[in-house]
Amino acid sequence: CTCVPPHPQTAFCNSDLVIRAKFVGTPEVNQTTLYQRYEIKMTKMYKGFQALGDAADIRFVYTPAMESVCGYFHRSHNRSEEFLIAGKLQDGLLHITTCSFVAPWNSLSLAQRRGFTKTYTVGCEECTVFPCLSIPCKLQSGTHCLWTDQLLQGSEKGFQSRHLACLPREPGLCTWQSLRSQIA
């Protein structure tokens, strides 16, 4: 199972639920579905209030039981380490795959943290991060922001991923904007 890591804004916008959590238990396999379940302790919710309701507490995250079908394998044994988890809701349960955005909170730049906390949501409705995988590539719409990180380096470590968000400049136009300048 292979997939290109998305821009964090894309991960935020395409997910039903975005939370900060610690992985606290040994994974278990559900025999009825052959999904594995990780026990988590949620510390913050950034997206999904309406889907879940304000009082909701996510205690488990679900993923396919095998790597070949995009199951997520959590490699860290540090149970106090916080992770940003962006996933999908299926029957009220949080599901992730290898292709989901799951990253140690401490590995995120201050700009990315700001994005998940506050800013990415502003761009979800109108704007689209458009991956440029090979040259030449051109914008197909004024609401697209051309994401070129993959051309230069690993997509998660690129400047646009770590410091920029695709946000509305005016109706029908989105541009890359610095998240740094928005950090109070």
């Epitope: 052959l34 594995q36 396919p64 790597e67 070949s68």
Partner: antibody, heavy 113, light 111 residues
Framework: QVQLVESGGGLVQPGGSLRLSCAAS????????MSWVRQAPGKGLEWVSV????????YYADSVKGRFTISRDNSKNTLYLQMNSLRAEDTAVYYC??????WGQGTLVTVSS | DIALTQPASVSGSPGQSITISCTGT?????????VSWYQQHPGKAPKLMIY???NRPSGVSNRFSGSKSGNTASLTISGLQAEDEADYYC??????????FGGGTKLTVLG
């Protein structure tokens, strides 16, 4: 008590097909993932395939992928393994097993011309 | 292709204790609490002796015990008896290959 009974083994020519069955009793069949595991003569154990309790997910070992199909009929408490394009190296005792615990007595499959 | 490493053979005298190791990786033995041990006498089906690392099914003697440390699981048989002579296989759930086995260990009871 929990019991698994395999059937359907036998002698088959290379390239041929065979369907194994496993009748389960003594437990809530649809709550458990079920596997097929095989053991070639004088060799160790090799996992072949697994199916989820509800039948929606199936996984296969690389050695049988595309040739074998696992299925189940929860109304009959029965597990199946359809084996096509059989090869000499598929010769083994095939065991039906509940996920990570109870096994049947096995059925011998011999692939030879 | 054997995924879990077991010693090919171990031996002990009646009454002694022996331990069989089973070494894997963080994606199998080390990552989950799903390690089982089976006893297989010649010509017979494997019999479950330990499941979920250290649990004994009903009917299995308390002389058999299981444990795990890191990526290595162990089966200990105390008060060795003649009928314990058999092949022993470890098995683990594995994230990459779903289910993996050790190559088997032949236990010989001396005397």
């Amino acid at each position: 008590q929990v019991q698994l009974v395999e059937s359907g083994g036998g002698l088959v020519q290379p390239g041929g097909s065979l369907r194994l069955s496993c009748a389960a009793s003594g437990f809530t069949f649809n709550s458990y993932a079920m596997s097929w595991v095989r053991q070639a003569p004088g060799k160790g154990l090799e996992w072949v395939s697994v199916i989820s309790g509800n039948g929606s997910n199936t996984y296969y070992a690389d050695s049988v992928k595309g040739r074998f199909t696992i299925s189940r009929d929860n109304s009959k408490n029965t597990l199946y393994l359809q084996m096509n394009s059989l090869r000499a190296e598929d010769t083994a005792v095939y065991y039906c097993a509940r996920f990570l615990d109870i096994w049947g007595q096995g059925t011998l499959v011999t692939v030879s011309s | 292709d054997i995924a879990l490493t077991q010693p090919a053979s171990v031996s002990g005298s009646p009454g002694q204790s022996i331990t069989i190791s089973c070494t894997g990786t963080s994606s199998d033995v080390g990552g989950y609490n799903y390690v089982s041990w089976y006893q297989q006498h010649p010509g017979k089906a494997p019999k479950l002796m330990i499941y979920d690392v250290s649990n004994r099914p009903s009917g299995v003697s308390n002389r058999f015990s299981g444990s795990k440390s890191g990526n290595t699981a162990s089966l200990t048989i105390s008060g060795l008896q003649a009928e314990d002579e058999a092949d022993y296989y470890c098995q683990s759930y594995d994230f990459v290959r779903f289910m993996v086995f050790g190559g088997g260990t032949k236990l010989t009871v001396l005397g």
